[in-house]
């Protein structure tokens, strides 16, 4: 899997989208988990509604929400009031029985608010950051890093 980097600003909300094949994953619940350590497990943060037909209903766990557009094939995770400790490697998963398929690996980065004590004329967006010289822009707040472009640490 490619790893997609989503940058958010501390104190603000960040939306992470995970597209998938709606036919292949028909009837499957989805989940959002966080990779613990370099070789650790992916710890479940939040999952979609127990009834797959109600997957469009937003479910919260603390400051993290999940909702699934099962027809369009897009899982959306919202991280509200982003904080530095939210930075990390996550996965969008498709569940079937006790198994989980990875839909997307997501690296969340939490940036300091560049507008603190500054004029609105200095308006800046994470997507305009020039720090991702090895990546191509996927949309305004994420950049997709292709495997092979940068050596990614091993995961179990």
């Amino acid at each position: 899997h490619n790893t997609t980097v989503f940058q958010g600003v501390a104190g603000q909300s960040l939306q992470v989208s995970c597209p998938y094949d709606s036919m292949k994953h028909w009837g499957r619940r989805k989940a959002w988990c966080r990779q613990l350590g370099e070789k650790g497990p992916c710890q479940r943060v939040v999952s979609t509604h127990n009834l797959w037909l109600l997957s469009f209903l937003r479910r919260w766990n603390g400051s993290t929400a999940i909702t699934d557009d099962t027809l369009g094939g897009t899982l959306t995770i919202t991280l509200r009031n982003l904080q530095p400790h939210d930075a990390g490697l996550y996965q969008c998963q498709s569940l079937h029985g006790s198994e989980a398929d990875t839909l997307r690996k997501v690296l969340v980065e939490v940036l300091a608010d560049p507008l603190d004590h500054r004029d609105a004329g200095d308006l800046w967006f994470p997507g305009e950051s020039e720090s991702f010289e090895d990546a191509h822009v996927e949309h305004s707040i994420s950049r997709s890093l292709l495997e092979g472009e940068i050596p990614f640490p091993p995961t179990s």
């Epitope: 940058q7 904080q83 690296l107 300091a112 940068i150 990614f152």
Partner: antibody
Amino acid sequence: QVQLVQSGAEVKKPGASVKVSCKASGYTFTGYYIHWVRQAPGLGLEWMGWINPYSGGTTSAQKFQGRVTMTRDTSISSAYMELSRLRSDDTAVYYCARDGGYLALYGTDVWGQGTTVTVSS
Amino acid sequence: DIQMTQSPSSLSASVGDRVTITCRASQGISNYLAWFQQKPGKAPKSLIYAASSLQSGVPSKFSGSGSGTDFTLTISSLQPEDFATYYCQQYSTYPFTFGPGTKVDIK
């Protein structure tokens, strides 16, 4: 073992720039953030910012935004911090430090030996 | 910015003493707090992260506690190599900030 080795001392004139390097060994460089912290003579520690060596993403303290540039070269497991428009009060020891969290911010665990930067006309 | 204060700013103690240093944050930081030891002319050494977790290789005479705004670092039995300056740091909110330090010297 995990080690961070920094470049040697620098003497710069006001208005100039300085670039400090930090070479990592003993771990997967792209898996752990690198922070930059400085310490002026006889004073405490001041956090400057971090770079994520995997993505190249950076953030910095408001105080340094526009003056500090953090980069990395994954091929040689090195991180760099460049500070521009130097002033005399930038005279300090500059440290790099690895974050202990896997692609996360969990607090630093290993520090470089420090690089003394002196700004004097 | 979150202000970190430490008390005392300095203390004199004898070998074998139990030493407690306090760190206070100007607002709640949960347990996102680290402690460092620094000796003159040397780089800081990480002792504790997440308020109470000991870094690998750090002796168990060091312990940390606290959550929210009030934290403590305790050295159960001071040894000659422990005379140094100790700093706390919060990494809950940008910018990450350090306390002013507590210097522990020989009585």
